[in-house]
């Protein structure tokens, strides 16, 4: 706590600006003017504040808001949004798009702290889903967002989001993820071709059931190994040799530099040694 | 890993301008850091002279302020000091250095340092 | 400015033997910083926001303090210790470092 001093003579801020650098912290705190520094926090960033001196701005902002920052001040806070802890962050009604992009610029190129990660949840409850706009937000800064979630959280997702989701995105999902978004993907995706439909389902295929698979199997997909790889070890089992050779097509041959690992070994044992021995690959059911 | 340079000549004569380079690998300049420039003289006293922000702003110790310049590169990734009117005062190991937060507090990653000689 | 006057100057201890150094303030801080110097060497970062050790830094080191008062303390000495140790502030501008604790080995 910053203790209270009276301002010297002179001294009292007329404004935010580099002149405040110099200023002791009992200096900040006596002679700059709370309701000042929320009108003009979108100078704050500009200005070379030290890690203390940013203290000193927080606590004043602290007392004239005991209940939450309004909106107008949170997207302007820029670094002081660092100095915040989740709890300061919970008081807080973040609606605006823009509001979230500026903070998460703030902290770009760091890993998820707690404070961004309250932040997100505060504002995906506010909205009450994660929509399109949102999710292409959140996945921009942190491509490993959506696998951060819960498969609980991920239900309330909409289809019309999914399109947002690229690839990587989903490179940290674990299967009970993916049983929840999979779904979602082929509703989303359901009107599109064959081809254009494998581009876009296919890295959520970790979630697809076996009836989805054998159906695959019939369009000339041609699934690469690191996608068969990812399958649901359950799903796959069903599929017969000729359904899987289908399905991977060209890539066929890959199975036998995965012949010890899940779910091609457990596949393998599943099947007939005269129905593998027809791919020709030297597999031993 | 963050790795800092300095270069530039080890002898300068009084009256002139000592100009050093420092070279960053690891990081970029423009990230979010400041870029600093610190000098240790002979006898082991340490003096922040500047330092060059990342959006290429500045801010100088009030003793030097009318004698130094701090500029960058960013394509370079290099970060530059000018001290101009030099005199045997200015004789110092001269480091460069980047800040270990998002605000001005402490002085995470440093040079080995340069030493430059102020003498006729 | 802020000036730093550290204490004592120049010390020496056995290994073993816990050390510990000061760093007096003339105005009030939150936070200090610490760095270790051997000859020859770039300062190293030891311990930042007053008592967080630095990446790399061996755990018998430690920082404690607040207000004008702060000190460096190491629980054990070895060898490898002897160094100059400066403590810095950037509390306000221009950030100013300590002059120096040079702990000898005995």
């Known amino acids: 706590e910053v203790e209270k001093t009276a301002c010297p003579s002179g001294k009292k801020a007329p404004e935010i600006d580099e002149s405040l650098i110099f200023y002791k912290k009992w200096e900040l705190e006596a002679c700059v003017d709370a309701a000042l520094l929320a009108t003009q926090m979108d100078r704050v960033n500009a200005i070379p504040f030290t890690y203390e001196q940013l203290d000193v701005l927080k606590h004043k902002l602290d007392e004239l808001y005991p209940q939450g920052y309004p909106e107008s001040v949170i997207q302007h806070l820029g670094y002081l949004f660092l100095k915040m802890s989740p709890e300061d962050i919970r008081k807080w009604n973040v609606t605006s798009l823009e509001t979230l992009k500026a903070l998460l610029e703030v902290n770009k190129g760091h890993e998820m702290s707690p404070q961004v990660a309250t932040l997100i949840d505060r504002f995906v409850k506010g909205r009450g889903q994660l929509d399109k706009d949102t999710l292409d937000t959140l996945t921009a800064f942190y491509p490993g967002y959506l696998c951060s979630l819960s498969p609980e959280e991920l239900s309330s997702v909409p289809p019309s989001s999914i399109w947002a989701v690229r690839p990587q995105d989903l490179d940290t999902c674990d299967p009970r993820q993916l049983d929840v978004l999979y779904p979602k993907a082929r509703l989303a995706f359901q009107n599109m071709n064959g081809s254009e439909y494998f581009v876009k389902i296919q890295s959520f295929l970790g979630g697809a059931p076996t009836e989805d698979l054998k159906a695959l199997s019939q369009q000339n997909v041609s699934m690469d190994l690191a996608t068969f790889m990812k399958l649901r070890t359950d799903a796959v089992l069903p599929l017969t040799v000729a359904e899987v050779q289908k399905l991977l097509g060209p890539h066929v041959e890959g199975l036998k530099a995965e012949e010890r690992h899940r779910p091609v070994r457990d596949w393998i044992l599943r099947q007939r040694q005269d129905d593998l021995d027809t791919l020709g690959l030297g597999l031993q059911g | 890993d963050v790795q800092l340079q300095e270069s530039g000549p080890g002898l300068v004569k009084p009256s002139q301008s000592l100009s050093l380079t420092c070279s960053v690998t690891g990081d970029s300049i423009t990230s979010g850091y400041y870029w600093n420039w610190i000098r240790q003289f002979p006898g082991n006293k340490l003096e922040w002279m500047g330092f060059i922000r990342f959006d290429g702003t500045n801010n100088y110790n009030p003793s030097l302020k009318n004698r130094i310049s701090i500029t960058r590169d960013t394509s370079k990734n290099q970060f530059f000091l000018k001290l101009n009117s030099v005199t045997t005062e200015d004789t110092a190991t001269y480091y460069c250095?980047?800040?270990?937060?998002?605000?001005?507090?402490?002085?995470?990653?440093w040079g080995q340092g340069t030493l430059v000689t102020v003498s006729a | 400015q802020i000036v730093l006057t550290q204490s004592p100057a120049i010390m020496s201890a056995s290994p073993g033997e816990k050390v510990t150094m000061t760093c007096s303030a003339s105005?009030?801080?939150?936070?200090m910083y610490w760095y270790q110097q051997k000859p020859g060497s770039s300062p190293r970062l030891l311990i930042y926001d007053t008592s967080n050790l630095a990446s790399g830094v061996p755990v018998r080191f430690s920082g404690s303090g607040s207000g004008t008062s702060y000190s460096l303390t190491i629980s054990r000495m070895e060898a490898e210790d002897a160094a100059t140790y400066y403590c810095?502030?950037?509390?306000?501008?221009?950030?100013?470092f300590g002059g120096g604790t040079k702990l000898e080995i005995k």
């Open positions: 105005s009030s801080l939150s936070y």
């Open positions: 250095a980047r800040e270990g937060s998002y605000a001005p507090a402490w002085f995470a990653y």
């Open positions: 810095q502030q950037w509390s306000s501008y221009p950030p100013t």
